[in-house]
Amino acid sequence: ECGHISVSAPIVHLGDPITASCIIKQNCSHLDPEPQILWRLGAELQPGGRQQRLSDGTQESIITLPHLNHTQAFLSCCLNWGNSLQILDQVELRAGYPPAIPHNLSCLMNLTTSSLICQWEPGPETHLPTSFTLKSFKSRGNCQTQGDSILDCVPKDGQSHCCIPRKHLLLYQNMGIWVQAENALGTSMSPQLCLDPMDVVKLEPPMLRTMDPSPEAAPPQAGCLQLCWEPWQPGLHINQKCELRHKPQRGEASWALVGPLPLEALQYELCGLLPATAYTLQIRCIRWPLPGHWSDWSPSLELRTTERAPTVRLDTWWRQRQLDPRTVQLFWKPVPLEEDSGRIQGYVVSWRPSGQAGAILPLCNTTELSCTFHLPSEAQEVALVAYNSAGTSRPTPVVFSESRGPALTRLHAMARDPHSLWVGWEPPNPWPQGYVIEWGLGPPSASNSNKTWRMEQNGRATGFLLKENIRPFQLYEIIVTPLYQDTMGPSQHVYAYSQEMAPSHAPELHLKHIGKTWAQLEWVPEPPELGKSPLTHYTIFWTNAQNQSFSAILNASSRGFVLHGLEPASLYHIHLMAASQAGATNSTVLTLMTLTPEGSELH
């Protein structure tokens, strides 16, 4: 070895100065008698080396680097050797920081593994190999007096947590715990924790389960769920309180919390939920009343609330077949009595024969809003119910009685807009209990089965706005029947359009006769069309060559018209406008020329 480097310190604070010396022995005879020693840090040559010959003939160069700003670098002592640089010796320099105080030390007791897991934040990077040690001792009281030390816990490289196994733990007294960080530049210690491992238990949540239905137990009420939970066995001896959270599976509802709850529940009924709705439920627990950590939420349990029997009023209406009066067509509409009135699975129409106690004969069971059945000859009324898996609605009696009540008068209808019609009447005396309003397409498209109907519960009403199934340019038949206590009045009907169409085209004008100052015109009227209102009048327009216009209004029954006061030998443009309540349409233009003064009249 020709050369040797010595440094003031191989590891320094980042940015601190460092001094190095390189000595070249005299017996390196192949070197120049006065060799020039060069310094290199990493790949860069460093100026400032002070070289001297020592008394024993060796050469020494000393350099001071004012700031070591590399966290790791090689410092080399070199000589020029021909055209290349020959490295005689090199040392590794390290620079960094002493360890910061570890912070946020926290510990959790894992009851499953019976070990205490502590974690911390090591602080900023030191750029130097830094070791962490979790240190602890046993103590009575608040750790002011230090008892026997517990075996150090050394984390694996790069980890900021360490696990003290059960055999080194003290479960029946407090422990003082801290983290020590150490590197070449110094040592630091975290603030000390004083804890009973049981005070920092990491609880696991109970296991939620659905309750197995027992034959004796009553089923849950509508909007209720029956569930139970089993505590996490290792945590049974820790006083805890728990809370449940639930939300509907569908929709954007947020979690609702229920608590505090006991650690164990062999049977728990959760109510106030939406009926017939799927819910997600979770539970978690915390040590109580002493401080602790919440467990994680348990795995989800998914349960569906039972539904409630339908709570609806059923408005009914019926019709008899004209050819077979015992065949009845019954119609109904469910009207919710509450915001959540329950799902309707279907409807049953039934009849209870007199003298047969308890016997109920079903006449029809349907999911539709009407059914047709043969009414037994002795039956005067039937019962209608809506049902689902939870039960039935209150029965609605339907009494089949003849029309014996007074009729309403002055039934009339008028359009409100293209999709609604107002039907009005004068109520009879005495007031009815209500009205049934039916409407559907009038002739020629009329059909009994395609009628829409509504019940008006107010017997004092004098009209009703029809908004369903109304389309413009269609003729509607509207039937109104007053309803009384045990009977009804005769039905009245009226026809109306919600919007009529303007005439689609006006009749073609034809020239019948022409003279020098007059012209006789005629046309064939358009046949009436369904959905188009009748013509109210015609207007005939004529314009001369000087663009002067003239017109005359004619009644709707007109079939022709004579234009008088025309100029001889003049050109005229004539058209007919056919008008109704709904609008007007023009015919095509007829152009004619009156005769010259010398010409003879044409007939």
Partner: antibody, heavy 118, light 107 residues
Framework: EVQLLESGGGLVQPGGSLRLSCAAS????????MGWVRQAPGKGLEWVSS????????PYADSVKGRFTISRDNSKNTLYLQMNSLRAEDTAVYYC???????????WGQGTLVTVSS | DIQMTQSPSSLSASVGDRVTITCRAS??????LNWYQQKPGKAPKLLIY???NLQNGVPSRFSGSGSGTDFTLTISSLQPEDFATYYC?????????FGGGTKVEIK
């Protein structure tokens, strides 16, 4: 000198309740776990329940879980055992014990007899 | 819960005999095993804690050994005052279960 003195035992009918007390002296009560152990006539020792120094940890034997409640009042240096829904098989001498730092029952009271009979 | 099984349930011995009682835990409990002595009509008394540590005031003829699941209490030379019932107890976990007891009687 450590002393533990139980009281509150006696005769009670099945389904009835009793509350046992254990007055402690001679040591810093609030720093130590405490426990109850019972011994039925002619039988071995049966651990009943223990309680941590702060009162937050209260394990019970399966045979008494849900019926017995252990508690402590550190200001009065007293340990309690509330016994409800008593059964004939709960008849025993009940001992109170002070636990050491490794869970050993270092000191015991003289015991109090509980008899459950109709 | 950890179950403790003691054997034998009783034994007869003479003064001066060496007596061995064993205790087995249903799962590993490290060294958290304690031994008690009880004489008729008296409260139990702690003899040995943490498997092998003699409680203050207990004669040195009593010794304990073992770790994990198998433990032994040995009385090296039985004395007249040692005729009693001996119990083991675990303190590894909080359900501080006792063994069924071993009654040492005079032969």
């Amino acid at each position: 000198e450590v002393q533990l003195l139980e009281s509150g035992g006696g005769l009670v009918q099945p389904g009835g309740s009793l509350r046992l007390s254990c007055a402690a002296s001679g040591f810093t009560f609030s720093l130590y776990w405490m426990g109850w152990v019972r011994q039925a006539p002619g039988k071995g020792l049966e651990w009943v329940s223990s309680i941590s120094s702060s009162g937050g940890v209260t394990p019970y034997a399966d045979s008494v879980k849900g019926r017995f409640t252990i508690s402590r009042d550190n200001s009065k240096n007293t340990l309690y055992l509330q016994m409800n829904s008593l059964r004939a098989e709960d008849t025993a001498v009940y001992y109170c014990a002070k636990l050491g730092e490794l869970g050993q029952m270092m000191y015991w009271g003289q015991g109090t007899l509980v008899t459950v009979s109709s | 819960d950890i179950q403790m099984t003691q054997s034998p349930s009783s034994l007869s011995a003479s003064v001066g005999d060496r007596v061995t009682i064993t205790c087995r835990a249903s799962q590993g409990i490290s060294s958290y095993l304690n031994w008690y002595q009880q004489k008729p009509g008296k409260a139990p008394k702690l003899l040995i804690y943490y498997a092998s540590n003699l409680q203050n005031g207990v004669p040195s003829r009593f010794s304990g050994s073992g770790s994990g699941t198998d433990f032994t209490l040995t009385i090296s030379s039985l004395q007249p005052e040692d005729f009693a019932t001996y119990y083991c107890q675990q303190s590894w976990m909080y359900a501080h279960m006792f063994g069924g007891g071993t009654k040492v009687e005079i032969k």
